[in-house]
Interface confidence: low
């Protein structure tokens, strides 16, 4: 009696279970009663990443430099090419089809994590005792100046955007 279901890595065709092609290979002809499934390797610019019965391999993704993209990892017969963005840019989505500039951290924020080709700058608010007075993609929050260590006193309190202002101690005789 013909099977109604096949084992893992097989497929049902003409009332018969045939082996799927392994990753990196495409289907040339289905198996018969007398022959095995015939598969052929994908060419250099192509891939298939699963056990399959595809008659065509997929083209590797093209990382178009005109779009700010560059190759992060070259594709193989079993994996697609992975693109990333050029310096100063990062991907808008996981599939990395387009790039946008890294954002800066505004005054009052410092860089928690510098951007990469695939992720944007992560900013964090400067906590009490720290400040940032610049819009920067690299600078962390800086600690307020310690007036005491310079034998000075605080004349103006610091904020998340400004440093403290130190001044001489009033020496009243």
């Amino acid at each position: 009696e013909p099977p109604t279901a096949c084992r893992e890595k097989q497929y049902l065709i003409n009332s018969q279970c045939c082996s799927l092609c392994q990753p990196g290979q495409k289907l040339v002809s289905d198996c018969t009663e007398f022959t095995e499934t015939e598969c052929l390797p994908c060419s250099e610019s192509e891939f298939l990443d699963t056990w399959n019965r595809e008659t065509r391999c997929h083209q590797h993704k093209y990382c178009d430099p005109n779009l700010g993209l560059q190759v992060q990892q070259k594709g193989t017969s079993e994996t697609d090419t992975i693109c990333t963005c050029e310096e100063g840019l990062h991907c808008t989505s996981e599939s990395c089809e387009s790039c946008v500039p890294h954002r800066s951290c505004l005054p009052g924020f410092g860089v928690k994590q510098i951007a990469t080709g695939v992720s944007d700058t992560i900013c964090e608010p400067c906590p009490v005792g720290f400040f940032s007075n610049v819009s920067s993609a690299f600078e962390k929050c800086r600690p307020w100046t310690s007036c005491e260590t310079k034998d000075l006193v605080v004349q103006q309190a610091g904020t998340n955007k400004t440093d403290v202002v130190c001044g001489p101690q009033d020496r009243q005789r």
Epitope: D64, N66, L67, G68, L69, T92, S93, E97, S98, C99, V100, P101, R103, S104, C105, L106, G108, F109, D120, C123, S135
Partner: antibody
Framework: EVQLQESGPGLVKPSQTLSLTCTVS????????WNWIRKHPGKKLEYMGF???????YYTPSLKSRITISRDTSKNQFSLKLSSVTAADTAVYFC????????????WGQGTLVTVSS | DIQMTQSPSAMSASVGDRVTITCRAS??????LSWIQQKPGGTIKRLIN???TLASGVPSRFSGSRSGTEFTLTISSLQPEDFADYYC?????????FGGGTKLEIK
Amino acid sequence: EVQLQESGPGLVKPSQTLSLTCTVSGDSVSSGYWNWIRKHPGKKLEYMGFISYSGSTYYTPSLKSRITISRDTSKNQFSLKLSSVTAADTAVYFCARFRRYDDGVDYWGQGTLVTVSS
Amino acid sequence: DIQMTQSPSAMSASVGDRVTITCRASHEISGYLSWIQQKPGGTIKRLINAASTLASGVPSRFSGSRSGTEFTLTISSLQPEDFADYYCLQYSSYPWTFGGGTKLEIK
């Protein structure tokens, strides 16, 4: 002074393709990021996507299967195509410029109403 | 997507009043928020960018501030030309998202 001007048909039939063009003066579409945003009847504003100085595009996930943004650098224009439209695509469509994070979206077109109706 | 919750959705006020509109972001947006104004004619004008920077040509009665993920637009003394719709826009991450809008009407 940077100016953006939307143009295109004001009435589109359901299932057809909506096509709009934004003509830019005072700046080049070969620099910055050029965006489409729409305002539905009522108050809801929706971001649609951009085409960048390099020609790369970003489409909001909910529209990705229907939207195409392209540009014509010789005419200094960028365009929106939205396929298989329904009444839910009736909106005022705006084009807008984005250059720097510190500046946000700094120039907007005046908007054009597109009605989807048979 | 980042959700922007704007309140109130509508309010009425008189010329000279001080008015405050707020937007809350569902995630940290690092200050990348704009306030925009839409007049009845339909034209959109940017008022504030980067949470608190006044856009060029915008009167100083408009100001923006931020506390954590809550952002505020304040109009210190309402003028007749200020009656319009106001929206916040986060442009920190894609897709950009807008608040639901505030309709500011004359009392």
